[in-house]
């Protein structure tokens, strides 16, 4: 299907209590139903965001309103395509204590890829 699925960045460090949006880009599918997985378990999140870039290119966001210790871990997104599950590169979400200056490291897998959005 020529499906391209990407999550970015590889590592994301945020302050406890801050909001964060994890990004997932899906190319080669119309209207994908993007599922997010954390440490192997599907994350149920009815209010995740989507942006249709074009008919065959969608970006999904897993929106975490207030990051706590329990949210730290390894995230990836997945979509069903022709009966097979396509999986993105994982993103490591790590926390620093509330009030510390968090910074995020990013390693682009695709030149057109955007940074995570931090605004709530």
């Amino acid at each position: 299907a020529g499906l391209k699925l990407m999550g970015a960045p590889v590592k994301l460090t945020v302050s406890q209590g801050q909001p964060v949006k994890l990004n997932c880009s899906v190319e080669g599918m119309e209207e994908p139903d993007i599922q997010w997985v954390k440490d192997g378990a599907v994350v149920q999140n009815l209010d995740q965001l989507y942006i249709p870039v074009s008919e065959q290119h969608w970006i999904g966001f897993l929106s975490l309103k207030s990051v706590e210790r329990s949210d730290a871990g390894r995230y990836w997104c997945q979509v069903e395509d022709g009966g097979e599950t396509e999986i993105s590169q994982p993103v490591w979400l790590t926390l620093v204590p509330r009030g510390s200056s968090a910074h995020h490291h990013h390693h682009h897998h695709h030149s057109a890829w955007s940074h995570p959005q931090f605004e709530k």
Partner: antibody, heavy 125, light 108 residues
Amino acid sequence: EVQLVQSGADVKKPGASLTISCQASGYTFTDYWISWVRQKPGKGLEWMGRISRHGSQTYYGPSFQGHVTISADRSTATAYLQWRSLEASDTAMYYCVRAGGQTSGGTIPEYYQHWGPGTLVTVSS
Amino acid sequence: SYELTQPPSVSVSPGQTARITCSGDALPKKYAYWYQQKSGQAPVLVIYEDHKRASGIPERFSGSSSGTMATLTISGAQVEDEADYYCYSISPAGNYGVFGGGTKLTVL
């Protein structure tokens, strides 16, 4: 213009089966989700469930899980709410809602901007 | 199952500030949405993601959230704001939606 046209009011006896429909127009059906909301006479809103754009994922509220089935037909841009066995307590107005609104941050599924007019279901012996 | 708790009624005089609260254990982690329903009509989205005004909603409507409490504020309430207001959010596990019991706002 986004339109959600719901099937007409229905009166049924307890134990009967029923399917009500919601036909969408004015947008690409598979770009959005459909949710169903119940409102009993003189009471508040109750979230029943939601179906994904492809129809591959359904979510149900705990009170409705196993009692109703939500489905969709992409070819006719129609969503359905189905009961196998109605009860008197199912008497209510049922709204279908286009789940998904455009915001500066993207399309938020739980942004319920477009509501159908509602279908009144009366279950009485 | 998860519940959102609202006061059954709030009354204000025209021009006063009306505040409607909604409490739920998951609100520190889940966004609140507010819907207005006038008699005999379908609901209308007023606020999404705690504090963002939906399109076409007057500036006198605002939302906020702190801890387990979300608040809808109507600054300078008008007679036409008289309606039922419902908060809405997602269950702690993120797998179903929940409406609060609703608050009847009277502007007299």
